[in-house]
């Protein structure tokens, strides 16, 4: 089959890094400077991606593979193949149209990217808050109040956790 195909289509023999040159009676020609073909049988070479501005070069272009970009410090990649760079924010913030804004009370963001997410509601799982949440960190849920009642376990229970706004009984 391969032999039949190559007899029918001489371009199928052109390896990566070359293109099938119609101007030269369909012989394989190496890709011109700053272009590439990553697969065989190509009729053109693709122009290399240039990592400019907020993009920086992670991998140089070659005749057989495109350049790869990432983002300069203070920015992070978005999209397939790092098609966009988005500004970083601090932990405890999210990026809005007006720039980086602190997370609202009851929400947190532990990364330099993404949006602020609500704290975990411990009570939905019948648990209590062991460590309060902050703008940068989610709450830490502890054992349920029932687990902490005397006689619930033969193991000595830990001291009850204080929930925010509660004074010790």
């Amino acid at each position: 089959f391969e032999r039949t195909r190559s007899l029918q289509d001489p371009c199928s023999n052109c390896p990566a890094g070359t293109f099938c040159d119609n101007n030269r009676n369909q012989i394989c020609s190496p890709c011109p400077p700053n272009s590439f073909s990553s697969a065989g049988g190509q009729r053109t070479c693709d122009i290399c991606r240039q990592c400019k501005g907020v993009f920086r070069t992670r991998k140089e272009c070659s005749s057989t593979s495109n350049a790869e970009c990432d983002c300069t410090p203070g920015f992070h990649c978005l999209g397939a193949g790092c098609s966009m760079c988005e500004q970083d924010c601090k932990q405890g913030q999210e990026l809005t149209k007006k720039g980086c804004k602190d997370c609202c009370f009851g929400t947190f963001n532990d990364q330099k990217r993404g949006i602020c997410r609500p704290w975990t509601n411990c009570s939905l799982d019948g648990k209590s808050v062991l460590v309060n949440g902050t703008k940068e960190r989610d709450v830490v849920c502890g054992p349920s109040p029932a687990d902490l009642s005397p006689g619930a376990s033969s193991v000595t229970p830990p001291a009850p956790a204080r929930e925010p706004g509660h004074s010790p009984q």
């Epitope: 890709c31 070659s62 005749s63």
Partner: nanobody, 111 residues
Framework: AVQLVESGGGLVQPGGSLRLSCAAS????????MSWYRQAPGKQRELVAW???????HYADSAKGRFTISRDNTKKTLYLQMNSLKLEDTAVYYC?????WGPGTQVTVSS
């Protein structure tokens, strides 16, 4: 324009070796891609070995492991070292850069 002239062809037995040379003159500073092609009687010209614009050597499947492309920029010369030659390597070998072609040098492998 760039002028190219090949040399080093000849008659050799199967399993033998030859070293082809391609001397370049003219505006060689614009050269980034240089290639060796060959054309056997009644067949289409085929790419054998080349230096890509990123300065990496590449080879057609038929040349891998047997042929080596190299160059000496001080002498403005491209080379093709051909080892373990086979009957099917018989062809006229051409040096190429862009639109410039040498006149070719005949390589005949025969017992």
């Amino acid at each position: 324009a760039v002028q190219l002239v090949e040399s080093g062809g000849g008659l050799v037995q199967p399993g033998g070796s030859l070293r082809l040379s391609c001397a370049a003159s003219g505006n060689i500073f614009s050269i980034r891609v240089m290639s060796w092609y060959r054309q056997a009687p009644g067949k289409q010209r085929e790419l054998v070995a080349w230096f890509a614009w990123d300065n990496i050597a590449h080879y057609a499947d038929s040349a891998k492991g047997r042929f080596t492309i190299s160059r000496d920029n001080t002498k403005k010369t491209l080379y093709l070292q051909m080892n373990s030659l086979k009957l099917e390597d018989t062809a006229v070998y051409y040096c190429n850069s862009g639109d410039s072609w040498g006149p070719g040098t005949q390589v005949t492998v025969s017992s």
